[in-house]
């Protein structure tokens, strides 16, 4: 078969639309991303062009390998939609739209503790809040570096709450919480809060 197709052949499935993709769909502002424009036909010399809406962002030639376009997402309007054009001679086809989801990273959460002390038990309420970051935010509470709660998803800006009751401990316990949202590999932790042992009147968080 000829390596060059005419426009009639292009209208059939012999030259399908290119595929536009990225390794990540969820990004934060200022993040560098790579977009891959590829085609099933590995024998043709194809000219790939990337567009955001109607703005031409770049052109690359390729044969058998995807074209890689490196971008930086700095503003909300740069989330997309993106299209890739594959062109052979004077004939071209476009990919489906691709858009990034821009997510603000979570800031370090703040952990607050309230304790109701009885003779035998401590009723502990933990509150965790990250004041910034795209929703939903998933909060997890830890005691001595071990998770003590499931992930608590918050779809608003109020703190996550977790209650537990413990027999009065004889040693210190350290609490902290984790906040993360849909940004991959991006989680933040609160400063640890240490609950002293029950010796004496050393319970600064306690409501007697």
């Amino acid at each position: 078969r000829k390596a060059v197709l005419d426009c009639e052949a292009m209208k059939t499935n012999e030259f399908p639309s290119p595929c536009l993709d990225s390794k990540t769909k969820v990004v934060m502002k200022g993040q560098n991303v790579s977009m891959f424009c590829s085609h099933k036909n590995k024998s043709l010399q194809i000219t790939y062009s990337l567009f955001r809406r109607k703005t031409h962002l770049g052109t690359q030639d390729g044969k058998g390998e995807p074209a890689i376009f490196n971008l930086s997402i700095t503003e909300a309007h740069e989330s997309g939609p993106y299209k890739c054009k594959a062109q052979v001679t004077s004939c071209s086809k476009y990919s489906r739209d691709f858009s990034f989801t821009i997510v603000d990273p979570v800031t370090s959460p703040v952990l607050n503790i309230m304790v109701i002390q009885t003779e035998t038990d401590r009723h502990i309420t933990l509150h965790c809040l990250s004041v910034n970051g795209s929703l939903p935010i998933n909060y997890t509470f830890f005691e001595n570096h071990v998770a003590i709660s499931p992930a608590i998803s918050k779809y608003d800006r109020e703190p996550a709450e977790f209650n537990l009751t413990k027999k009065n401990p004889g040693e210190e316990e350290e609490y902290r919480c984790e906040a993360k949202n849909r940004l991959p590999n991006y989680a933040t932790y609160s400063h640890p809060v240490t609950m002293p042992s029950t010796g004496g009147d050393s319970c600064p968080f306690c409501l007697k």
Epitope: S99, T101, L135, P136, Y155, R157, E158
Partner: antibody, heavy 119, light 110 residues
Framework: EVQLVESGGGLVQPGGSLRLSCAAS????????MNWVRQAPGKGLEWIGM???????FYANWAKGRFTISRDNSKNTVYLQMNSLRAEDTAVYYC?????????????WGQGTLVTVSS | DIQMTQSPSSLSASVGDRVTITCQAS??????LAWYQQKPGKAPKLLIY???TLASGVPSRFSGSGSGTDFTLTISSLQPEDFATYYC????????????FGQGTKVEIK
């Protein structure tokens, strides 16, 4: 470009039911919260409820029980099922997408669909 | 639940006037407040989010300020196209909600 198109409004008798649709294009509804807001003639905006990425729903206190929000991901469409309709439910119903995956400002609105409850 | 109270409910002003609309939340909502403009027969349009950030394409004569419970929308020099109804909206809490929106402020021609 993101677009929201409501449909399904019309005249319904008191006690009847109606299902409104909001078809979204240019946006992936699995990442954003979709809201329903209504406006009675000559009145202010009234939030009804929202559906978020995981299909979880939240409602205004007054809407619980009679109103149900659902979603069809394959059609990228959100629905508002309204039951036991009353004259005071007469309003323009808008869908609005937030800028976030939870409670947020509503940066894109549909054109609205009029629901008239009357005998 | 958080109640949003706008004032005034209506005002009359002339082209070129400086106009201020206030919105008060019944409890702190940090800076999670938005402002909308609505013209008759049209859907609302987002003007300002996060209390003070101008939405895309909104003229710079619009500005927002405040945090906690007290917020202000200011139009520095009223234009003919600004005669409309303005709404504030809390974007902070989903707990026990009756409405996200204030009752609206109608800006009319004097």
């Amino acid at each position: 470009e993101v677009q929201l198109v409501e449909s399904g409004g019309g005249l319904v008798q008191p006690g009847g039911s109606l299902r409104l649709s909001c078809a979204a294009s240019g946006i992936d509804l699995s990442y954003y919260a979709m809201n329903w807001v209504r406006q009675a003639p000559g009145k202010g905006l009234e939030w009804i409820g929202m559906i978020v990425g995981g299909g979880i729903t939240f409602y205004a206190n007054w809407a619980k029980g009679r109103f149900t929000i659902s979603r069809d991901n394959s059609k990228n469409t959100v629905y508002l099922q309204m039951n036991s309709l009353r004259a005071e439910d007469t309003a323009v119903y808008y869908c609005a997408v937030g800028s976030d995956g939870g409670i947020s400002d509503f940066n894109i609105w549909g054109q609205g669909t009029l629901v008239t409850v009357s005998s | 639940d958080i109640q949003m109270t706008q004032s005034p409910s209506s005002l009359s002003a002339s082209v070129g006037d400086r106009v201020t609309i206030t919105c008060q939340a019944s409890q702190s909502i940090s800076s999670y407040l938005a402002w909308y403009q609505q013209k008759p027969g049209k859907a609302p349009k987002l003007l300002i989010y996060r209390a003070s950030t101008l939405a895309s394409g909104v003229p710079s004569r619009f500005s927002g300020s405040g945090s906690g419970t007290d917020f202000t929308l200011t139009i520095s020099s009223l234009q003919p196209e600004d005669f409309a109804t303005y709404y504030c909206q809390q974007a902070y809490s989903l707990s026990n909600v009756d409405n996200f929106f204030g009752q609206g402020t109608k800006v009319e021609i004097k």
